[in-house]
């Protein structure tokens, strides 16, 4: 049975600033055919037929749901892209994470400007501070890492705060063993 294809992002953030670039790639098993990919944005078929969809100089209209399909195989699960205009943007490797998987958070400055005195907050409480910009990199996420995160920092000597982001860590499905 052919597997569903999967959409991946490069860079891996599904929240980006207006004007930035991102490439969506449709990964699947044994898809070697040229021009065999269908891309759907908010349900509408895109003109792109390559296995990669390049979004250059992102606009607000590029926000929304993306799915891909190889030949007659099932559509991929949707990926949601959101385009922002702000001073700070909290980016996450994933917003729903399986327990035991890594979780990476980044406090991204508009136009890649330097951000200083960055603080990450979780559920309203300061979580991590450093003099300059820095990341949070959790190797093995646990359910306790679930919560609402945001970051604050200084850009050009002024204080800014990102929009909040909900992160959910879900328990890995347990294998079922039947007694013989």
């Amino acid at each position: 049975v052919p597997q569903k294809p999967k959409v991946s992002l490069n860079p891996p953030w599904n929240r980006i600033f207006k004007g930035e670039n991102v490439t969506l790639t449709c990964n699947g098993n044994n898809f070697f055919e040229v021009s065999s990919t269908k891309w759907f944005h908010n349900g509408s078929l895109s003109e792109e037929t390559n296995s990669s969809l390049n979004i250059v100089n992102a606009k607000f209209e590029d926000s929304g749901e993306y799915k891909c399909q190889h030949q007659q195989v099932n559509e991929s699960e949707p990926v949601y892209l959101e385009v922002f205009s702000d001073w700070l943007l909290l980016q996450a490797s994933a917003e729903v994470v399986m327990e035991g998987q890594p979780l990476f958070l980044r406090c991204h400055g508009w136009r890649n400007w330097d951000v200083y005195k960055v603080i990450y907050y979780k559920d309203g409480e300061a979580l991590k501070y450093w003099y300059e910009n820095h990341n949070i990199s959790i190797t093995n996420a646990t359910v306790e890492d679930s919560g609402t995160y945001y970051c604050t920092g200084k850009v050009w000597q002024l204080d800014y705060e990102s929009e909040p982001l909900n992160i959910t860590v879900i328990k890995a499905p347990r294998e079922k063993y039947w007694l013989q």
Epitope: K117, K128, Y131, I136
Partner: antibody
Amino acid sequence: QVQLQQPGAELVRPGASVKLSCKASGYSFTSYWMNWVNQRPGQGLEWIGMIHPSDSETRLNPNFKDRATLTVDKSSSTAYMQLSSPTSEDSAVYYCARGSLYDGYLFLYWGQGTLVTVSA
Amino acid sequence: DIVMTQSPLSLPVSLGDQASISCRSSQSILHSNGDTYLEWYLQKPGQSPKLLIYKVSNRFSGVPDRFSGSGSGTDFTLKISRVEAEDLGVYYCFQGSYVPFTFGSGTKLEIK
């Protein structure tokens, strides 16, 4: 109130590794960097490194890069420093210390220190 | 690494006198974020160090106002306006601006 509890002393054979503990209480353990500082007998203070319990990010003094490993156990609010292949030069008091980088200081609360003696 | 050089190594004073300790860094410790993370600690015999001054000139709460810090760039000074018996011990300057963070070698304040 904030407390950092450390064992009083550890005797270790040269070449054997030693793991020092620092149990924190009275504050949100995952929200502050934990530092390790040592002091050889009759000498000054030396910063070894720091670890952030939220994600175990570590910043180490290059002098200790190959010999000190900093870890945390969030469930017990305990920070650890493992010193591998110690020599007599490593005999010292080892402190854990917590400050508030946001407010601009690194060491406000100190453990009582663990006296490590490296001796055959 | 940034080297912190303290002077003098020993400072004999009479109670009630003013004491002044100098600390020089081998390069500027003004961080690119605009702050200078220069701290002063006092360690009494058999005790852990105690924070006195942070970010060059900010007195930590509960620290008597006879303690003051000043300086910028690479030159810093701790002044004690009227030395009291409880002030005796070893004073350390410390830079927390750039990793690896470094302490000065210490200044022992003792009775003349």
